[in-house]
């Protein structure tokens, strides 16, 4: 939905650097098919995590570990010739500032890994 | 840090559903390895598309769209065998309500693909 | 068939120490990778620190590394991981792991409590 040319775009130097927000999610039922159950049929399977701080919103966030270093072959063993590396995203969160039972929030940006992925290896070859 | 034991956490019933929110952000310059190369070294490789939306807070998320039905061998070549799926994760986005140059947001939650593994498909044995 | 025997598990308080020790049945000269894996109580086994068959030697992530460090005795053929400035989290059962002609090899495991 195009903006008012006029308004100022979140983002922009100018925006108000304090703004309301209602925590009525909308969207809340999001058909959340995430991952399902790709972290164990994966060839680079993951196990989730439970990363759980009060202070922030949302407060339980799941972080993916890769199980093996390598990916797992048709024969259900690791090989080495590949990796299981983590794809991490940048999300938002609202953390309580200042902390203990306040209203205020400030956004903060987090580095999570959501889950993993096979890669060819980066080989470096010696002069 | 743990909370004072009489607060509400934020995702509680009788938390406020308005807050104040700074939108400074902590954390800007995240070490963002973000999948690094991982999209064109993946044997489940991906494109990254732009979504944009002034209205929403960010304005900017990348989407990744798998770039085959199957997974890349170590030939190169594309196996059927296996299937490439999108990783998808919720995330917490801030959406402007009502529209146009106001500073109240709403959360909105958003499902986006982060990027995509590599799994052994689910076989249906037809009776 | 290769056997892999751990020891050296126990319970400990948090910010303290533990070696844990892996006997090896076969030469872990000829492995393609040892190590560790661990599986945290209502997860699957995931792993902790590798060393390939180049010598690399490889950790998980950033909270194991710099904590823990794994070393292979090829005379003495076992392999040993030592946990320092332990946590909680690292609550696990530690199995022993090998890789032999293709072949993926776990220890029976032995558990690690950490006490907070």
């Known amino acids: 939905s195009p903006q008012n040319p006029g308004c100022p775009n979140a983002e922009d130097k100018n925006f108000p650097r304090t703004v309301m927000v209602n925590l009525n999610i909308r969207n809340r039922n999001t058909n959340s098919k995430r991952a399902s159950d790709y972290y164990n049929r994966s060839s680079s399977p993951w196990n989730l995590h439970r990363n759980e701080d009060p202070e922030r919103y949302p407060s339980v966030i799941w972080e993916a570990k890769c199980r093996h270093l390598g990916c797992v072959d048709a024969d259900g063993n690791v090989d080495y010739h590949m990796n299981s590396v983590p794809i991490q995203q940048e999300i938002l969160v609202l953390r309580r500032e200042p902390r203990h039972c306040t209203n205020s929030f400030r956004l903060e940006k987090m580095l999570v890994s959501v889950g993993c992925t096979c890669v060819t290896p980066i080989v470096r070859h010696v002069a | 840090s743990p909370q004072n034991p009489g607060c509400p956490n934020a995702e509680d019933k009788n938390f406020p559903r308005t807050v104040m929110v700074n939108l400074n952000i902590r954390n800007r310059n995240t070490n963002s390895k973000r999948a690094s190369d991982y999209y064109n070294r993946s044997s489940s490789p991906w494109n990254l598309h732009r979504n944009e939306d002034p209205e929403r807070y960010p304005s900017v998320i990348w989407e990744a769209k798998c770039r085959h039905l199957g997974c890349v061998d170590a030939d190169g070549n594309v196996d059927y065998h296996m299937n490439s799926v999108p990783i998808q994760q919720e995330i917490l986005v801030l959406r402007r309500e009502p529209r146009h140059c106001t500073n109240s947001f709403r959360l909105e939650k958003m499902l986006v693909s982060v990027g995509c593994t590599c799994v052994t498909p689910i076989v249906r044995h037809v009776a | 068939e290769v056997q892999l025997v751990e020891s050296g598990g126990g319970l400990v308080q948090a910010g303290g120490s533990l070696r844990l020790s892996c006997a090896a049945s076969d030469s872990v000269f000829t492995a393609k990778a040892v190590g560790w894996y661990r599986q945290p109580p209502g997860l699957q086994r995931e792993w902790v620190a590798i060393?390939?068959?180049?010598?690399?030697?490889?950790y998980a992530d950033s909270s194991v590394k710099g904590r823990f460090t794994v070393s292979v005795d090829k005379v003495k053929n076992t392999v040993t991981l030592q946990m320092n400035s332990l946590k909680p989290e690292d609550t696990a059962v530690y199995y022993c792991y090998a890789q032999w002609m293709g072949r993926d090899y776990w220890g029976q495991g032995t558990q690690v409590t950490v006490s907070s």
């Open positions: 060393i390939t068959s180049g010598g690399k030697t490889n």
